[in-house]
Interface confidence: low
């Protein structure tokens, strides 16, 4: 044991130090005192600390701890906050482009529908955006509303244009006929399936990122218990009471204290690991019809095909609907007019060819890789904090909470603490209520993520057989059903450099005219320009 340093006969250094924490010297003894009222820095001899000083040290220690914790989580917090914002904005851009593609398709192929179609398309994609952000909207209802709204316009503008104004009150009948007669074939059901799958996954992805932020924010702003404050004070400040201003705590001692203080927080570790791994599974399954980018950007083509389907059956439909909706009171009898011989196009829809150069998919995978480097974040916190606060290297000539020691011994330190308070008790108290709440939220999101990802991402599948798909049709299990039929197959050149062009918007009025094909230009859409990445931190 090294000899103790000569005591500071005047408490001058302690006074000088303490004045920085608390202006005024009224609490600091001028010379060492017995310190019998001390509760944390229990003196082995005369001390330069008072009870009031102890209280100030405890406050300061807890503040330091809170700031260390915030510092520890800063990089992780920034990563998730930035990505949540970037993905949310990128998804909005996908929606905006999808809307513009669809509007361009109407403008180029069905200009007589455009004023109203633009309105319905706008409402549909607004609902898509709201759904992604968590709004309580039913995807099937969104799709039904789109086609319910479109059909009366198609009928009055394209199928029976000569209707007098007085016949416009047949809109309700036409909306009903749209469903009963399945005038768009199975395309609405196909869109429902694709859109609901891709949007549900997108929505849960954003929810998971936002919960990640909440987890970090919760642990970032934890208020540490008084017991923890006492342990921290003993570790960081009690040495000053003995005039040992330059002595640093032993590293091993710091680890013991941090494990005590952080016991509740470290309980998050198991659920945090599961969160990152579940998020990775979800991301791995986000392709084809589980990728909203892929689905929404091909939607204009499927809608075009659905209108072509109406077109092919227009003759029979006009006759049937003419009878059905001639007087709106006949509406209740409409099922009697169900046409048995509508033309059913059983040609297999071709896949919209997607060239992935740099898509949201690669961004998602990049985020997961970065998040995985933080998989041990919570279990590593005590060690991180010790390595980022003043500790003695190699545990030599360091402070063990009671005295300056040549070498730290965990056993001796624990024994020395027994009469002051029990570390074990501190650990056994269980996590703070806020930590328990965040663990419950993590459990819930992990359950949701697992549900979405397993088995093989097919949990969301619905059986569409009863809807009339036959072999050769585009059934639900065929992930490829994204758009383009016959010779009008769409080639989507998907160079999504979203982060480079967050302000970019396709103006429908600029779309080149082409009344024959589904696509605005030469059977190919490539409105995404490589403008270079603006948001380089994600690279």
């Amino acid at each position: 044991q090294p000899p103790p340093p000569p005591p500071d006969a005047t408490c001058h250094q302690v006074r000088s130090f303490f004045q920085r924490l608390q202006p005024g010297l009224k609490w600091v003894p001028e010379t060492p005192v017995p310190g019998s009222d001390l509760q944390v820095c229990l003196p082995k001899g005369p001390t330069c600390c008072s009870r009031k000083m102890e209280e100030k040290y405890q406050l300061t220690a807890r503040l330091n701890m809170e700031q260390l914790l915030q510092s520890a989580s800063m990089e992780l917090k920034f990563l998730i906050i930035q990505n949540a914002a970037v993905f949310q904005e990128a998804f909005e851009i996908v929606v905006r482009h999808a809307k513009n593609y669809t509007n361009a398709m109407f403008k180029n192929n069905y200009p007589s529908l455009t004023p109203q179609a633009f309105e319905f398309v706008g409402e549909f994609f607004t609902d898509v955006s709201l759904y992604i952000l968590g709004s309580d909207i039913n995807v099937d209802d969104m799709v039904n509303e789109l086609f319910d709204s479109l059909f009366p316009v198609i009928y009055t503008q394209l199928m029976n244009p000569g209707l007098p104004d007085s016949a416009l009150d047949i809109n309700e009948c036409l909306r009903g006929a749209r469903r009963d007669l399945k005038v768009f074939g199975n395309f609405p059901k196909l869109i429902m399936t694709q859109v609901s799958k891709s949007l549900q996954v997108t929505r849960i992805f954003l929810q998971a990122l936002n919960l990640g932020i909440e987890v970090i924010n919760t642990t970032d702003h934890l208020k540490f218990s008084k017991d923890c404050g006492r342990m921290l004070t003993r570790m960081w400040y009690c040495s000053y009471c003995q005039g040992l201003m330059m002595v640093k705590p032993c590293g091993g001692y710091c680890n013991v204290v941090m494990q005590g203080c952080m016991a509740g927080v470290v309980e998050i570790d198991k659920y945090w690991r599961e969160y990152i791994l579940s998020l990775e599974e979800l991301v791995n399954g986000m392709y084809r019809i589980y990728d909203m980018e892929n689905v929404l950007l091909g939607l204009f083509s499927t809608i075009h095909d659905s209108i072509q389907y109406v077109q092919k059956n227009a003759g029979k439909l006009t006759t049937t609907i003419g009878k059905l909706c001639a007087h709106s009171q006949q509406r209740q009898y409409r099922s009697a007019y169900y046409p048995e011989d509508l033309f059913i196009d059983k040609k297999v829809l071709k896949v919209a060819h997607v060239e992935h150069e740099e898509t949201l998919s690669s961004r998602r995978r990049e985020l997961i890789q970065k998040l995985k480097s933080f998989i041990s974040f919570y279990s590593a916190l005590p060690g991180y904090i010790c390595s980022h606060s003043p500790v003695a290297e190699n545990d030599t000539l360091c402070w063990n909470g009671q005295e300056l020691v040549e070498r730290y011994s965990q056993k001796a330190a624990r024994n020395g603490m027994k009469n002051q308070f029990n570390l074990h008790e501190l650990k056994m108290k269980g996590p703070e209520p806020v930590v328990s709440q965040i663990i419950d939220k993590l459990k819930h999101i992990n359950q949701l993520l697992r549900t979405m990802s397993m088995p093989k991402g097919r949990v969301l599948d619905k059986n569409l057989d009863e809807e009339g798909f036959e072999s050769g049709d585009c059934g639900d299990d065929e992930d490829e059903c994204i758009g383009g039929s016959g010779d009008g197959m769409i080639k989507v050149k998907n160079q999504l450099r979203f982060l480079a062009e967050l302000a970019y918007d396709l103006d429908v009025d600029d779309a080149p005219g082409n009344s024959q094909q589904a696509t605005p230009k030469d059977n190919e859409i490539s409105t995404f320009h490589n403008l270079g990445n603006v948001h380089s931190p994600l690279k």
Epitope: F17, R20, L21, Q67, S71, P390
Partner: nanobody
């Protein structure tokens, strides 16, 4: 190992201004508190100002409050001390220091890395 390099010192007339800079390298600058200290000839080194890791909190010695402003640019790994209304008693060697504490403490024992110092001379 952390390196701190001060610059911006010099000779200035009373009432004038100077801006000191301290460029840091060697560890994640944005995680750590930073401070400025000064030492006049024949006197002990004293605290001048400190700033927390995020820049959200600043602290000043009473003698410089209202005249000096500490700031940081985490993107540039640099901390600054803007000194206005300088007085002859501000003459000293000014040291930049980096602390393991994110808060930017006020006492030099809580700083573990120091720059070489830059001379500030205020003439009357």
């Amino acid at each position: 190992q952390v390196q701190l390099q001060e610059s911006g010192g010099g000779l200035v007339q009373a009432g004038g201004s100077l801006r000191l800079s301290c460029a840091a390298s060697g560890r994640t600058f944005s995680s750590y508190g930073m401070g400025w200290f000064r030492q006049a000839p024949g006197k002990e080194r004293e605290f001048v100002a400190a700033i927390s890791w995020s820049g959200g909190s600043t602290y000043y010695a009473d003698s410089v409050k209202g005249r000096f402003t500490i700031s940081r640019d985490n993107a540039k790994n640099t901390v600054y001390l803007q000194m206005n209304s300088l007085k002859p008693e501000d003459t000293a060697v000014y040291y930049c220091a980096s602390s393991a504490w994110p808060a930017g403490p006020k006492h030099q024992v809580e700083y573990d890395y120091w720059g070489q110092g830059t001379q500030v001379t205020v003439s009357s």
